[in-house]
Interface confidence: low
């Protein structure tokens, strides 16, 4: 018997293995990031690997446990929140997910001064939202759609609202459509900077039509889930904003903030609230036809105990080529004078840039400019403004962090991240401590993600917070696919694409091609980020080429590309995927008889329309939880891009852009349609209607439903889904199992 070493040394290739589907489903190659929970200019909290809550002081280098894992375990806490006066911690347990951001939980208050849980006047359960005041240890919480206030954790609560009612009136929390499509938060209440006032939204859903679907569960009869959900053109929620003095809440009670007259004249939305000082607040409003936004700065009138929003402090933002803003209207970042602010909006050339507004928007001073876009303003201090953009080397799918010195004239700009780890890191975000004394940089790729801590004055790296060493070691013997990001120039349109190539890719050979598409307005798929996911496996193990293409309607490349799809969803997004496929075929290494497309949500819509385009390019494709008609989707999202489904507006295109209208064209492709029956977002109705149209047209197709699963198809459904899709693609591409 000859014993052979487990590794053959004559070829490094032989020691390497391809990714497996199991690797992906088990999350074997997932990465970690480190976001400090800042509690001062130089201190942050972090939950250690063994679940202790640890306070770190950057300047002294000291760290100590403020809350032990035993205390966390005693109430099965999965989250925590330290009061600003550091006397109390809330512990969150019994997490129960509702929609994308919302969940309910049980909350316990732990007194750090005596090491005991606060007894007496305990919080009710389950609570929909809870938060500390920014100073001290006041608590605001939402229970059964009403808002309550506690001056101290052990005090009895003061009830602020009384009209809260399930599915009818929401106080301090958003209804479904505001949560998903406008605020992107689970809360709709905001403390003033020193905790004097509490602002909150009231959403009245009384007249909104309800979506109802079955939840099968385990009982003899299914439950019916009812959600007030305004579809395109339907009655919308009615929103009001109130502010209450939390020091003397019973004195005058909640005061309503007036809506600007030009907004209130027709249907409108509230889009965000930003406190400037304890006695100045900034509200943003948006017309239902979402091309006019008004930013309104309001002041507290001590004599009247009311909020005054003078017209001279109303700033109008209007788009003439599309909708206002990008995905959302941007929010202002106020400077230290408490009246001027920085905001991102389109410049005269149609690129989103930072502007400084001192008195009127007409006199705004443009801070950044160029054929690239400013993406986020992180922090404004007395002398610096930190923002992210995709300027560097003209790659729209990158993000670098910049500092503009606003304290000196002329302002100077410095890229903080461009040259730090240039090959590894091209896509950053940042998290700043108070006054930007320190900040953390989180790099998402294209190399293995890394999080680092930096000095806010010098930008010097202080330490590595997380470098994913274990992941790096685990990947050493994995044959990862190659990735390239390039662009196609077609008819004056730039189509950026990411191509994921098999490890032993050979340009002289022919490979099956899978297009992965999302393509929704203001989205971006071609990004310089690290990922080991399903498509990595398909390239590594199954030898497919995968491509992602950012076509018209996608973000961060200027308004011409972004607003091209305005009022015409489902046209150019599809055209551009098809155009890219034709270009890929011209490259010579694609087997044009084996081309597939797949997408989820908006991507499911685009993949369905691409398959039904009649081009003959695609052999097969998959749509997961697709939109099939814009009349079935949420008003706030749909109308932003499509207008209203009325005869005098855009009904014709609503009707022309459905998947069902193209049922006949699915005859010559293999189509796999997948949807969760409890999808609160893109309702199962969408796929039910596609299936009905295909059956009526006598077109064969494959389908899979996931009982009681929502838009995310999580848990065991995920494993089943990817296994099922893998079999479908391998069969389509004639790959052996």
């Amino acid at each position: 018997i000859v014993l052979r070493p487990s590794r053959v040394h004559n070829s490094e290739e032989n020691t390497m293995r391809a990714l497996t589907l199991k690797d992906i489903l088990n999350g074997t190659f997932s990465y970690k990031t480190f976001f400090p929970n800042w509690i001062s200019g130089q201190e942050y909290l972090h939950q250690s690997a063994d679940n202790n809550i640890v306070l770190y002081n950057i300047e002294t280098g000291q760290s100590y446990t403020i809350l032990s894992n035993r205390t966390m375990k005693s109430v099965n806490a999965s989250n925590y929140g330290l009061s600003p006066d550091r006397q109390f911690v809330y512990l969150e347990s019994d997490y129960s997910k509702l929609w994308r951001y919302s969940y309910t939980a049980t909350y316990y208050i732990y007194d750090l001064s005596n090491g005991e849980f606060v007894r007496g006047n305990e919080l009710p359960r389950p609570i929909q939202y809870l938060c500390w005041s920014p100073v001290g240890s006041k608590l605001a919480y939402v229970y059964q759609n009403n808002i309550y206030l506690k001056q101290r954790p052990g005090d009895p609560p003061f009830q602020i609202t009384f009209n809260g009612r399930e599915n009818k009136i929401f106080n301090g929390i958003p209804d479904w459509v505001y949560e998903e499509e406008m605020l992107a938060t689970k809360y709709a209440l905001w403390w003033s900077p020193n905790g004097k006032f509490l602002a909150y939204a009231e959403f009245n859903d009384t007249d909104i039509p309800v979506i109802a679907y079955s939840y099968y569960g385990d009982e003899q009869y299914p439950r019916t889930i009812n959600i007030p959900y305004p579809k395109a053109g339907a009655k919308n929620p009615v929103v009001r904003i109130f502010i209450i003095d939390t020091t003397y809440p019973a004195y005058v009670g909640p005061q309503e903030v007036p809506v600007p007259a030009m907004i209130a004249s027709s249907d409108y939305y509230f889009s965000w609230l930003t406190w400037v000082t304890d006695e100045r607040v900034c509200l943003q409003w948006l017309k239902r036809v979402q091309n006019v936004s008004v930013l309104s700065i309001c002041d507290f009138r001590e004599d009247w105990q009311t909020w005054d929003c003078p017209k001279t402090q109303e700033h109008i933002e209007e788009s003439r080529t599309g909708w206002a803003g990008g995905f959302f209207v941007s929010t202002p970042v106020f400077s230290y004078d408490a009246i001027s602010y920085y905001k991102i909006f389109s410049d005269k050339d149609g690129y989103k840039h930072i502007h400084y507004i001192k008195d009127t928007v007409e006199n705004a001073i443009q801070i950044t400019s160029g054929k690239w876009e400013a993406i986020n303003i992180f922090r404004v201090t007395q002398d610096s403004l930190f923002y992210s953009s995709n300027e560097f080397e003209e790659y729209p799918g990158r993000r670098n962090i910049y500092r503009i010195s606003i304290g000196s004239y002329p302002p100077s700009k410095k890229c903080v991240t461009c040259h730090l780890r240039k090959e590894r890191c091209q896509y950053y975000t940042a998290s700043f401590s108070d006054y930007a004394k320190y900040y953390a940089l989180v790099c998402y790729g294209p190399g293995i993600p890394i999080s680092t801590l930096h000095d806010g004055r010098t930008d010097q790296e202080i330490k590595i917070l997380e470098e994913n060493k274990e992941l790096e070691n685990a990947l050493k013997n994995i044959q990862l696919p190659k990735e390239e990001i390039k662009k196609l120039e077609v008819d004056e349109i730039t189509l950026w694409y990411k191509m994921i190539l098999p490890p032993q890719f050979d340009r002289s050979k022919k490979y099956p091609l899978l297009i992965q598409v999302y393509g929704g307005p203001c989205s971006q798929s071609v990004r310089s980020v690290f990922a080991v996911n399903w498509i990595s496996y398909l390239a590594s193990k199954e030898g497919m080429v995968i491509a992602l293409v950012d076509g018209r309607g996608t973000a961060f490349q200027g308004d011409k590309l972004l607003y091209a799809v305005y009022r015409k969803l489902g046209v150019y997004e599809v055209e551009d995927q098809i155009t890219a496929v034709r270009k890929f075929i011209e490259m010579g290494f694609i087997d044009e008889k084996r081309i597939a497309i797949w997408g989820w949500s908006y991507g499911g819509y685009v993949s369905s329309l691409a398959l039904a385009s009649g081009t003959g390019l695609f052999k097969c494709g998959i749509a997961v939880a697709p939109v099939s008609s814009w009349e079935y989707y949420a008003s706030v999202y749909t109308e932003r891009f499509m207008g209203l489904p009325t005869k005098d507006d855009n009904l014709e295109h609503y009707k022309n852009s459905t998947v069902m209208a193209r049922a006949e064209y699915f005859r010559n492709v293999d189509y796999l349609l997948i949807h969760g029956t409890a999808d609160d977002n893109v309702h199962f109705q969408n796929s039910a209607q596609i299936a009905k149209a295909l059956v009526n047209a006598q077109v064969d197709f494959q389908a899979m439903w996931y009982s009681d699963q929502n838009h995310g198809l999580s848990g065991l459904s995920t494993n089943h889904l990817y296994t099922h899709m893998t079999h479908f693609l391998k069969q389509c591409f004639s790959l052996s199992d």
Epitope: M262, K287, V289, V292, I316, E317, E318, S319, R320, T321, F345, S346, D347, K348, H355, V361, E362, N363, A364
Partner: nanobody, 118 residues
Framework: EVQLVESGGGLVQPGGSLRLSCAAS????????MGWFRQAPGKGRELVAA????????YYPDSVEGRFTISRDNAKRMVYLQMNSLRAEDTAVYYC???????????WGQGTQVTVSS
């Protein structure tokens, strides 16, 4: 480029009316929000009316609300300011202006004088 020429100014008694017109040339007119500004002697330029590109949205400061009306005719490339119940404090040079999509006014006319006096 957008060129703007105002007309219709003149002398009027308090309580009277005037209609200012602004003729625009240049191919991007219909994409521009438009505004009327005024500048009284020794004072800064003040926005008195604004209108969105479609005419669907208008804006007036409190000082002229209910008295002034802005309108536009995209086909004729004209913007109008109807001024009623004029007061002495409305005396100023009135300028027509064209903005970008966020109502930054970057094109200006030469101005027309309005004098309200008995």
């Amino acid at each position: 480029e957008v060129q703007l020429v105002e007309s219709g100014g003149g002398l009027v008694q308090p309580g009277g009316s005037l209609r200012l017109s602004c003729a625009a040339s240049g191919r991007t007119f219909s994409y521009n929000p438009m505004g009327w500004f005024r500048q009284a002697p020794g004072k800064g330029r003040e926005l008195v009316a604004a209108i969105s590109r479609t005419g669907g949205s208008t804006y007036y400061p409190d000082s002229v609300e209910g008295r002034f009306t802005i309108s536009r005719d995209n086909a004729k490339r004209m913007v109008y300011l109807q001024m009623n119940s004029l007061r002495a404090e409305d005396t100023a040079v009135y300028y027509c202006a064209a903005g970008t999509d966020t109502w930054h006014y970057n094109y200006w006319g030469q101005g027309t004088q309005v004098t309200v006096s008995s």
